[in-house]
Amino acid sequence: APTSSSTKKTQLQLEHLLLDLQMILNGINNYKNPKLTRMLTFKFYMPKKATELKHLQCLEEELKPLEEVLNLAQSKNFHLRPRDLISNINVIVLELKGSETTFMCEYADETATIVEFLNRWITFCQSIISTLT
């Protein structure tokens, strides 16, 4: 059974992930971002279901395409280089989902824009955090 300390750690990691995803979304939605139109043409894949930490596998698998799209944006829109930002997210995701179980992600048929993709994972983080508090 999860201890209060492990629950607290999970909550902090989720909050960190949430902040990183929100920072990316804010950088993209920044009214000064001339790349928004181009960024919105890129397709992202969404999980059929995302209710548990193991479903973060679906986020992990789309981090490289996310980095590619962020490479289009001026680095001043973000505090970190896309490579460093995605690397940080990857570390948190790996810790949260755990490496013991191998989960095969199932994707929805419809693709999403980067904004829809980020909003979906922001909602996921918020939902899990609310169950922990």
Partner: antibody, heavy 121, light 113 residues
């Protein structure tokens, strides 16, 4: 028809610079990134970098960071690459290229005919 | 950067033969979301620009003869040319475009025996 028309061959002395052009037709240059690729027969193909003509933003492969400067002029629907501090190693054919569609930056489907740059004293 | 190891370096063939060119990447090029491998194959003839033959590892570019077949997934890829024609004599390159910077294989020269 989508075409990328490049400038003619160039002969340069070591230490000098050269500016190559790539004029796009059949589409609006601001809709796609323009990539530049180097071909040396003994080294194959190497990606140099890209420019987004819409706002002039660029990305370079690390080894070309201080060698190449990419620019674009939307009014003439053209992209340019300046190569500085030329050495005989820069002798190569340089290509500009565009991706297959706008939903992803690669692969390169449309290519210019190439510009041969020869660096010799 | 992803390293693309292409083999063989050169290949001498007779017309009508079948040839295979291999490309191995240092990391997987498969995107799970769409089950596509971000790998392309190019043909380059002397004095010409490279021509896109195959993208997403196995999708033939419009107008490319169907004797050019791309296969493979993950890290191992193959370009097969069945019934080689004289006009197929050229250099062939693989390109990964999964992770920036995009990187090419060293190339394979297809020559006539």
């Amino acid at each position: 028809e989508i075409q990328l028309q490049q400038s003619g061959p160039e002969l340069r002395r070591p230490g000098s610079s050269v500016k190559l052009s790539c004029k796009a037709s059949g589409y609006n240059i601001t809709d796609y990134l323009i990539h530049w690729v180097r071909h040396r027969p003994e080294h194959g193909l190497e990606w140099i970098g890209w420019i987004d003509p819409e706002d002039g933003e660029t990305r370079y492969a690390q080894k070309f960071q201080s060698k190449a400067t990419l620019t674009a002029d939307t009014s003439s629907n053209a992209a340019y690459m300046q190569l500085s501090s030329l050495t005989p190693e820069d002798t190569a054919t340089y290509f500009c290229a565009r991706s297959l569609d706008s939903t992803y930056n690669y692969p390169f489907a449309y290519w210019g005919q190439g510009t041969l740059v020869t660096v010799s004293s | 950067d992803i390293v693309m190891t292409q083999s063989p370096f050169s290949l001498a063939v007779s017309e009508g033969e079948m040839v295979t060119i291999n490309c191995k990447s240092s990391q997987s090029l498969l995107r799970s979301g769409n089950q596509k491998n971000y790998l392309a194959w190019y043909q380059q003839k002397p004095g010409q620009s490279p021509k896109l033959l195959i993208y997403y590892a196995s999708t033939g570019q419009s107008g490319v003869p169907d004797r050019f077949i791309g296969s493979g997934s993950g890290t191992d890829f193959t370009l097969t040319i069945s019934d080689v024609q004289a006009e197929d004599l050229a250099d062939y390159y693989c390109l990964q475009h999964w992770i920036s910077p995009p990187t090419f294989g060293a190339g394979t020269k297809l020559e006539l025996k």
